[in-house]
């Protein structure tokens, strides 16, 4: 459960954080799992532990393996595992999948590519950026802090981006590279009058008294990023927060989904321990944006338990 994959290239720096967190004051011990041998804390060692961090300066293929970190809190020793793999440097330009960090998407309006794991290192600007092994040049590319900004993004900008920086440890410099894919979203967006997909207008939802019930209000508002769009529930025309029934709560945070390229939102209304009086309420699913407001009304009805005859 508390396990994390980390990878790096031989002769580069690799810094791994313990998957278990803890206060800065907590002691963290590191072990090489296969031998249960303690990792030293002295910085003169090539591989050493520094609190929550395990440092390979530089890494070697033979360092691959599982490392155990134990965070010693006042009450418990909390254990985490770092699964470290060090790969040989590739002679050709291709970056294999196993060295890739998570893919990021960009669009004309938002084209930031963050350099993965950089926050673990002691580095100084500027970062060097490469696309498909070529150094990025030209005014469209701006290395800013720990990310790359691409102006006027085009579909041709999709590809594998590598950031390269220098980690400094006690005056010694070590190279680090990290690669991730960048995809470009077509953002010919538009906005339209809200369309409520669920619930249906005047829907009757069957519920069981004493059980929990969920109602989902789901609506779409157009394509691409929407400037203003919201879905919410009302009870008898009153906002949930103002209604004052703690059993009935809206799910915090609206889920944004892109169904068939459409920008949609949903809000779940959770009713705990359904009571008779809940059947008397009017439940309104509201969807609104700059075009206007659409409302679908739901009522609850009692689900009759099925009679079991022998």
């Amino acid at each position: 459960k508390f396990s994390k994959q980390s990878w790096g290239l031989e002769n580069e720096a690799l810094i791994v954080r313990c998957p278990r967190q803890g206060k800065p004051s907590y002691t963290v011990d590191w072990y090489y799992s296969q031998t249960n041998k303690s990792i030293p804390t002295q910085e003169r060692n090539r591989v050493f532990a520094s609190g929550q961090l395990l440092k390979f300066l530089p890494a070697a293929v033979a360092d691959s393996g599982i490392y155990t970190c134990i965070v010693r809190s006042p009450t418990f020793n909390r254990t985490g595992y770092a699964n470290v793999t060090i790969y040989k440097k590739q002679s050709d330009c291709n970056v294999p999948d196993y060295l890739m960090y998570s893919t990021v998407s960009g669009s004309e309006k938002n084209s930031k590519i963050y350099c993965p794991t950089i926050d673990l290192y002691n580095w100084t600007a500027p970062l060097e950026w490469f696309k498909n092994c070529q150094a990025l040049q030209g005014s469209r590319y701006r290395a800013h802090k720990s990310f790359l900004v691409i102006d006027n993004v085009m579909t041709e900008d999709a590809g594998d981006y590598t950031c390269k920086f220098i980690h400094n440890e006690n005056g010694a410099n070590y190279s680090v590279t990290a690669t991730r894919s960048f995809t470009v979203k077509d953002e010919q967006g538009f906005s339209l009058f809200p369309v409520i997909g669920a619930p249906a207008q005047n829907e009757i939802k069957e519920v069981e008294i004493g059980k929990n019930a969920n109602l989902t209000c789901s609506a779409c508002f157009g394509k691409g990023t929407q400037f203003l769009a919201a879905v919410l529930w009302q009870l008898n025309g009153t906002k949930i927060t103002d209604f004052g029934e703690p059993r009935i709560q809206q799910e915090e945070g609206q889920n944004q989904s892109f169904s068939n390229g459409l920008a949609c939102l949903d809000m779940v209304l959770r009713i705990a321990d359904v009571k008779e009086e809940d059947l008397l309420l009017q439940y309104d699913c509201l969807a609104l944006n700059l075009h206007g407001l659409r409302r679908h009304t739901v009522r609850l009805s009692r689900k009759n338990p099925i009679d079991h005859h022998s």
């Epitope: 459960k1 967190q21 206060k23 006042p74 009450t75 909390r78």
Partner: antibody
């Protein structure tokens, strides 16, 4: 939302044992340690101990060591605290509680409703 | 064990007053947590890690301090703040609480 629901009030005789349960919901039970705190009538709060439901590891206030047993049933997401050799000064409300962020010990953010245990002959 | 000493043990203040409670630890602690408890209810976390406001807690509550001396403040006392307040350290086993400060309205 996180909920901790405790068992009902108990009346026990001196020398007996009591087992209080705490059923957790709204989160992954094994992701958070469960702590036990008690409060005697009109008195302050006193930490008794804790259990890590994932491993079964326990941590105790030395004052209760040997008298208290903490267990956890992963299948029902329920933690138990058993206190033996009861005496009148064990009369208290017993709470189960957990931190908001387990690894960072950011205070007891979630509490059960409390279980009143009365020790009387 | 780290002993936590709260002062005052009780205090009476008027609505709108600034109220301060102190907590002194018998040896240095890294962080302090503060709780509010109303009669017949479980305690409620107000401040964690000395100065961080717990979720949903009004901003009139605040905390500060370091080492052995910590302070809890209500900037403008409200009628609903009538309760007993406890400090708690999580720096060493056993975890310990202050004896409580009972707050009343004048």
């Amino acid at each position: 939302q996180v909920q901790l629901v405790q068992s009902g009030a108990e009346v026990k005789k001196p020398g007996a044992s009591v087992k209080v349960s705490c059923k957790a919901s709204g989160y992954t039970f094994t992701d958070s340690e469960m702590y036990w705190v008690r409060q005697a009538p009109g008195q302050g709060l006193e930490w008794m101990g804790a259990i890590d439901p994932e491993t079964g590891d326990t941590a105790f206030n030395q004052k209760f060591k040997g008298r208290v047993t903490m267990t956890a049933d992963k299948s029902t997401s329920t933690a138990y605290m058993e206190l033996s050799s009861l005496r009148s000064e064990d009369t208290a409300v017993y709470y189960c509680t957990r931190a908001f962020d387990n690894d960072n010990d950011e205070g007891f953010a979630y509490w059960g409703q409390g279980t009143m245990v009365t020790v009387s002959s | 064990d780290i002993q936590m000493t709260q002062s005052p043990s009780s205090l009476s203040a008027s609505v709108g007053d600034r109220v301060t409670i102190t907590c002194s630890a018998s040896s240095s602690v890294n962080y302090m947590h503060w709780y509010q408890q109303k009669p017949g209810k479980a305690p409620k976390l107000l401040i964690y890690d000395t100065s961080k406001l717990a979720s949903g807690v009004p901003s009139r509550f605040s905390g500060s301090g370091s080492g052995t001396d910590f302070t809890f403040t209500i900037s403008s006392l409200q009628p609903e703040d009538i309760a007993t307040y406890y400090c708690q350290q999580w720096s060493s086993n056993p975890l310990t609480f202050g004896q409580g400060t009972k707050l009343e309205i004048k």
